[in-house]
């Protein structure tokens, strides 16, 4: 029987019985919190040969090996990952081996083991037989192998039963438990499985098989199964599904999705029925079964229950990712944050469609609305009191509502209303109202001229630059020495400049009131003698790449409440010159015949420039006598990374300081310090495992079902 | 081969309450939805309402929404219909049916709600 | 609700014709419309699904077309075993609806 879509075995050891009739979990298996330690040796599920998904493990009591569990389990075929791993043991308090000793592959992504501080048997484990790769494999902060004193099966009595590979440089016994080898096929059958008598498979076949050769006889296929064949691609009118087998266009069209809440069902595209369109395409039409390719961002269409959404931080914005039109009213509150525009844009900056209102208030954080990026329509379905669709009040760091010249905004119906926004100015509202086509709608007190804009520069003189020099890491810019009525209102400039690798940067973007912003400033002291122009040398600048630069003149904002002018200059875009590439990555060499040799590379990660050829330069060497010394006949593998030594809930293990030679005199001497690389290597360790325990715990704790 | 067998069908006073089970074999059970749908002695077909078996999300026809009930049990593989405050007009043979088309349907159980 | 009218409510056809049931919705449901069979005392069997596709084990005979809010059945030689109601229904929006039927008898 095939189970799924995922398994969740929680809380209550007795929900394993749902296992009882499974060959297949087509999906994920859980196994977790569960606290009181049971006696599990009841539990026994042979018939279970197959994960299409991923195994998590945690936080099982009593449970001290999984083989009793799964005897056959053989393929993991990591279809979907946990945070890429395929299989997941973590905190399994009383696990003392893992003992899935049927388990032969397993297809994508990596393992990780941390924290079990009990568990033995991992170091006799040979991963790269099971896996492709296990350099990403993590294993850490388990039992130390010191005090496991493993031991395979038949090693007592000098009899041993299992087979030797080299990990690490150690030629040894693999097993998963005091009694149970781990499988290895002959050499003659290659990448193929083998039989429980070493007779090989079919190529067809994963994992293992009941009879050589016979791709009706595998235990899982390397492929696609269908009508209890392995095949290597789905027959005509059938269709890839869940990564492992072929179902026809009926199942597709009746199945459901795992998290679904209505029958919007599976599509079929591209030879496979999948629960979505791809990225990039949309169903063609509700409910259908194809996909179509989307004309820009593909709409999504996000509702919000109680018909207004609020947006008070980046959590609430979070819900709308992706989101294209929304159905419904926002209300943006954001009085504080870190990052908030640059956070906002990426939660928001798809929305096109607001099928209510638009009602910013209270947001001290936001210098400007530019994180609605693609915000082309408001529709009015829903207005505030006063038939408002658009309404602005007490934002008091709001300086820009969208850079207009690169906008199109249309408001279908309602009127605009702003208020208390003090660095706003008027002439920025009147702009909207022509864009919006909202223009007459207003009435005289919607858009108050007192205190809008009341603590700006809002008449702002264009500041223009005299000179740009360049060179690869330098940029010297000079401007028109700015002269308002009264000298003494001008205090200083401010440049601002950041990468802009296109020409479509605004002086908004990524700031907020907060103290984030995307362009880099520097203030500039007015020039002593009156007749030298401004300037600035920048520096410490990429060479080969395009910069956006502005001055802002600083001037006193009020004087006897008049407005007073201001002044800035428009974005110049100015390039760096080009500098030496840094050196091309990844150089391959390989020989394909005794007199000539194919190198490859990739292109350096800093050009610097234009590449325009590359200059390749050999020279004939000695041979090393190192290569006669090694025996190439010794099944070497990519060592896994250590094991710790002890469990990681200890940031530091203090150990005797190693006696050994340091700097240029013999003699015992204290462990070298850590380098810089070292610290920053633990740190980065430290910082990715709480990262992956964060995503667990928001992974698995939910709330109860009401 | 796919099977479902409602049950729990039978004569229930007006005001009554009944449960119908559906029981469902033969396939993945928490892969397909499991929809109910009615019908009234020789008159035609009404939708009922579907629920999910593998999250226990439902959708109802506003029509049954306050009185009928829909739940899944994911280690029996069955689907049960709670009617209550019946009434003479939910007589009818009630059927389960498999699938976002509807591709595998029940035989069917009598519920009569007569006095 | 989206009304789904089916006509004929019934009609007299011989063995070897060619039958056509049409069903109109009240508005646009795409292609999501399914065609049912039911014979007296059993429970309806699925035709044909997004419109156009025919169930498996359904014979060729039987074939759907349509999108929007007209959609056919059409059975283009009638047998013994045809004889039965027929109903069209879209799934296109809650609550789902299914037409009134229409009824196959031998003339």
């Known amino acids: 029987e095939i189970c799924g879509p995922g398994i969740d075995i929680r809380n209550d050891y007795q929900q394993l019985k749902r296992l009882e009739n499974c060959t297949v979990i087509e999906g994920y298996l859980h196994i977790l919190l569960i606290s009181k330690a049971e006696d599990y040796r009841s539990y026994r599920f042979p018939k279970l040969t197959v994960i299409t998904e991923y195994l998590l493990l945690f936080r099982v009591a009593g449970l001290e090996s999984l083989g009793d569990l799964f005897p056959n389990l053989t393929v993991i075929r990591g279809w979907k990952l946990f945070y890429n791993y395929a299989l997941v043991i973590f905190e399994m308090t009383n696990l003392k081996d893992i003992g899935l000793y049927n388990l032969r592959n397993i297809t994508r992504g990596a393992i990780r083991i941390e924290k079990n501080a009990d568990l033995c048997y991992l170091s006799t484990v040979d991963w790269s037989l099971i896996l492709d790769a296990v350099s990403n494999n993590y294993i850490v902060g388990n039992k130390p192998p010191k005090e496991c004193g493993d031991l395979c099966p038949g090693t007592m009595e000098e009899k041993p039963m299992c087979e030797k590979t080299t990990i690490n440089n150690e030629y040894n016994y693999r097993c998963w438990t005091t009694n149970r080898c781990q499988k290895m096929c002959p050499s003659t059958c290659g990448k193929r499985a083998c039989t429980e008598n070493n007779e090989c498979c079919h190529p067809e076949c994963l994992g293992s098989c009941s009879a050589p050769d016979n791709d009706t006889a595998c235990v899982a296929c390397r492929h696609y199964y269908y009508a209890g064949v392995c095949v290597p691609a789905c027959p005509p009118n059938t269709y890839r599904f869940e990564g492992w087998r072929c179902v026809d266009r009926d199942f597709c069209a009746n199945i459901l999705s795992a998290e679904s809440s209505d029958s919007e069902g599976f599509v079929i595209h591209d030879g496979e029925c999948m629960q979505e369109c791809p990225s990039g395409f949309i169903r063609n039409g509700s409910q259908s079964m194809y996909c179509i390719p989307c004309e820009g961002p593909c709409p999504k269409v996000c509702e919000e229950e109680k018909k207004t959404k609020t947006i008070d931080s980046v959590t609430s914005a979070q819900m709308l990712q992706g989101c294209t039109i929304f159905k419904g009213n926002l209300l943006i509150n954001i009085r504080r944050g870190n990052n908030i525009a640059s956070e906002l844009e990426n939660f928001m900056g798809l929305i096109e469609v607001v099928t209510g209102y638009v009602k910013i208030r209270h947001s001290h954080a936001l210098v400007s609305l530019s994180f609605l990026k693609n915000l082309r329509l408001i529709l009015g379905e829903e207005q505030l009191e006063g038939n408002y669709s658009f309404y602005v009040l007490d934002n008091q760091n709001l300086q820009q509502l969208w850079d207009w010249d690169h906008r199109n905004l249309t408001i279908k119906a309602g009127k605009m209303y702003f208020a208390f926004n003090p660095k706003l100015c008027v002439s920025e509202i009147y702009r909207m109202e022509e864009v919006t086509g909202t223009k007459g709608r207003q009435s005289k007190g919607d858009i108050n001229t007192r205190n809008n804009g009341e603590r700006a520069s809002c008449e702002s003189d264009v500041l223009h630059f005299t000179s740009t020099t360049t060179s690869k890491n330098r940029i010297i810019i000079t401007w028109h020495r700015y002269r308002p009525p009264d000298y003494r209102d001008l205090i200083s400039f401010t440049v601002y400049y950041k990468e802009a690798p296109f020409k479509n940067v605004t002086e908004y973007d990524g700031q907020d009131a907060c103290g984030s912003n995307s362009w880099n400033m520097v203030d500039v002291d007015l020039p002593p003698n009156k007749d030298v122009e401004p300037g600035i040398l920048l520096h410490g600048l990429k060479p080969w790449t395009q910069y956006a630069v502005y001055v802002k003149a600083v001037t006193l904002t009020m004087v006897e409440n008049d407005h007073i002018r201001g002044a800035k200059s428009e974005i110049l875009y100015i390039r760096t010159n080009a500098s030496v590439p840094s050196i091309p990555l990844d150089v391959l060499s390989a020989s394909n015949s005794s007199s000539q040799l194919i190198v490859k590379w990739n292109p350096p990660s800093l050009p610097n420039g234009n590449l325009s050829y590359y200059i390749v330069r050999w020279q004939r060497q000695p041979q090393d006598g190192y290569l006669y010394r090694h025996n190439y006949c010794s099944k070497d593998k990519i060592p896994i990374r250590k094991y710790a030594d002890g469990t990681i809930d200890i940031e530091e293990v203090t150990e005797n300081p190693k006696t050994e030679v340091c700097g240029g005199e013999k003699g015992p001497c204290c462990a070298c310090p850590k380098t810089e690389a070292e610290k920053q290597a633990e740190k980065e360790e430290a910082e990715y495992r709480k990262v992956f325990e964060n995503f667990l715990h928001n992974s698995i704790f939910v709330p109860r079902p009401e | 081969e796919v099977q479902l067998v409602e049950s729990g069908g039978g004569l229930v006073q007006p005001g009554g309450s009944l449960r119908l089970s559906c029981a469902a074999s033969g396939y993945t059970f928490t892969r397909f939805w499991i929809h109910w749908v009615r019908q009234a002695p020789g008159k035609g077909l009404e939708w009922v309402g579907e629920?999910?078996?593998?999250?226990?999300?439902?959708n109802y026809n506003e029509n049954f929404k306050n009185r009928f009930t829909i739940s899944a049990d994911t280690s029996k593989n069955t689907a049960y219909l709670q009617m209550n405050s019946l009434r003479a007009e939910d007589t009818a043979v009630y059927y389960c049916?498999?699938?976002?088309?509807?591709?595998?349907w029940g035989q069917g159980t009598l519920v009569t709600v007569s006095s | 609700d989206i009304q789904m009218t089916q006509s004929p409510s019934s009609l007299s056809a011989s063995v070897g014709d060619r039958v056509t049931i049409t069903c109109k919705a009240s508005q646009n449901v795409g292609s999501n419309v399914a065609w049912y069979q039911q014979k007296p005392g059993k429970a309806p069997k699925l035709l044909i699904y997004?419109?156009?596709y025919r169930y498996s084990g359904v014979p060729s005979r039987f074939s759907g077309s349509g999108s929007g809010t007209d959609f056919t059945l059409t059975i283009s030689s009638l047998q013994p075993e045809d004889f039965a109601t027929y109903y069209c229904?879209?799934?296109?929006?809650?609550?789902?609806?299914f037409g009134q039927g229409t009824k196959v008898e031998i003339k």
């Open positions: 629920i999910n078996p593998s999250n226990g999300r439902t």
């Open positions: 229904h879209q799934y296109n929006n809650y609550p789902y609806t």
């Open positions: 997004s419109a156009s």
């Open positions: 049916a498999r699938g976002g088309r509807l591709d595998q």
